[in-house]
Interface confidence: low
């Protein structure tokens, strides 16, 4: 069909909850394109009727709510004037028994559902809610072990739960809850979050610290080879992982077939009070689809990104 497969995204979801996925792949979707969603290689597009339980809402696919039988691979086809790209989203629906500890919790938790608080510090948890504009989210409530969180140490601020003077007792199973309203109907959104506590104070007051990159763009010519280092300082006894990700996927997995973009071997230099780590990302050949996409360096709870952009035209050459 002439469409280029970009990548596969895996999502593990709880049944009976609203879920939305936005088909976005800059710079492709930043231009004049049409986006169409399909399920399991069906030739019939997902409905655009807003009353449908599953429907396309602009570039989003929206499930109101997710059902047991909705598991499967969904394709989003992005058509431009001269191009066609396809994103595959593999959805696995499972049944989460929220308040029954005898039954297993969330399988294969993604980073959004595993968060860390720092002992003795003022810290926060984030409730990740991604929905189109047509969905109105009510105020967020926070629960720990199925009891609503109350107390002077806790403050709800938009999508965050601020925790002052974090203690060891703050580890455990949290959930954030919001009521989503769409076309006059209400649905409950629940995100489970497994919270662990770390004691490390860290070098320079943060654990760990990304020295480079600094959330910036890099001008690079199409077709060139590019190597970017991620430089991180961390405590000598740290157990943090350092890696490069794109679209929340390890670059080595994301580009598993082409191996066009790879993560390098980590090296480190030892100082008296800390280590300086370096892990690079190599673009064997910069392609059009790389521009505008955040390539994220992750180091424990810290992140920083680079975005590739085309150099401005040099009119002096004409």
């Amino acid at each position: 069909d002439g469409c280029k497969d970009i990548f596969m995204k895996n999502e593990i979801l709880s049944a009976s909850q609203p879920f939305a996925f936005n088909c976005t792949f800059p710079p492709i979707t930043s231009g004049e394109v049409s986006v169409t969603w399909y399920k399991n290689s069906s030739k019939i597009p997902v409905s655009k009727i807003i009353q449908s339980r599953i429907h396309q809402d602009e570039t989003w696919i929206l499930f109101l709510p997710m059902e047991w039988g909705d598991s499967g691979v969904y394709q989003c086809v992005i058509k431009g004037r001269d191009s066609c790209h396809r994103i595959h989203v593999n959805l696995t629906v499972f049944e989460k028994h929220w308040c029954d500890t005898s039954i297993g919790g969330l399988p294969n938790l993604s980073d959004e559902y595993k968060q860390i608080l720092h002992l003795g510090k003022d810290d926060s948890l984030t409730c990740h809610l991604h929905f189109p504009k047509s969905c109105v989210l009510g105020p967020i409530k926070w629960y720990k072990d199925c009891n609503e969180i109350k107390g002077e140490r806790f403050t709800v601020l938009e999508t965050r739960l601020l925790v002052s003077n974090v203690s060891a007792e703050d580890r455990g199973n949290y959930a954030c809850q919001a009521i989503l309203t769409h076309s006059g109907k209400q649905y409950e959104v629940l995100n489970g979050i497994t919270v662990s506590i770390t004691e490390r104070a860290g070098y320079g007051g943060s654990v760990p610290k990304i020295i480079y990159p600094k959330n910036h763009s890099i001008e690079v010519q199409l077709g060139t080879t590019l190597i970017v280092d991620c430089n991180v300082t961390d405590t000598k006894d740290n157990t943090n992982l350092r890696c490069w990700r794109v679209n929340n996927t390890l670059v080595d997995d994301y580009y598993d077939e082409s191996k066009r973009i790879r993560e390098g071997v980590e090296t480190h230099v030892s100082f008296r009070e800390h280590n300086l780590y370096t892990v690079n990302i190599t673009f064997l050949e910069v392609k059009m689809e790389d521009y505008g996409l955040p390539f994220m360096c992750h180091a424990g709870v810290s992140t920083a990104y680079i975005i590739l952009q085309l150099p401005a035209p040099d009119f002096r050459a004409y």
Partner: nanobody, 128 residues
């Protein structure tokens, strides 16, 4: 749209039994709480019983424990409340509620009422 339709209420003598049904349509309940609350004239609403997680978790208020049983059908479209050993103080309008937060305190014995939908109610009268 969401509809909860209760049935099965009526008048019964003390010690008698009733079975209330709540037919739910237009909503998915897979992980949400379904339950019953009651309200007698001039009294506060009381959470009576809830069921969640596909029947894996149930809650009963102390006043009905051992006498009332909550259950649901396999399709999870109907929730039942079996009332036995009824007492005059059980007299009230019984409401079915759904779309509750399974994390909300209502679902496991608290006093807040975080349901999204409730029915019109069915009257239960216990008197000799």
């Amino acid at each position: 749209d969401v509809q909860l339709v209760e049935s099965g209420g009526g008048s019964v003598q003390p010690g008698g039994s009733l079975r209330l049904s709540c037919a739910a349509s237009g909503y998915s309940y897979r992980t949400q709480c379904l339950g019953w609350y009651r309200q007698a004239p001039g009294k506060q609403r009381e959470a009576v019983a809830t069921i969640s997680g596909g029947g894996t978790s149930t809650y009963y208020s102390d006043s009905v424990k051992g006498r009332f049983t909550i259950s649901q059908d396999n399709a999870r479209t109907t929730v039942y409340l079996s009332l036995t050993s009824l007492k005059p103080e059980d007299t009230a309008t019984y409401y079915c509620a759904a779309g509750l937060s399974v994390l909300g305190s209502w679902c496991h014995g608290g006093s807040s009422y975080e349901y999204t939908y409730s029915g019109q109610g069915t009257q239960v009268t216990v008197s000799s």
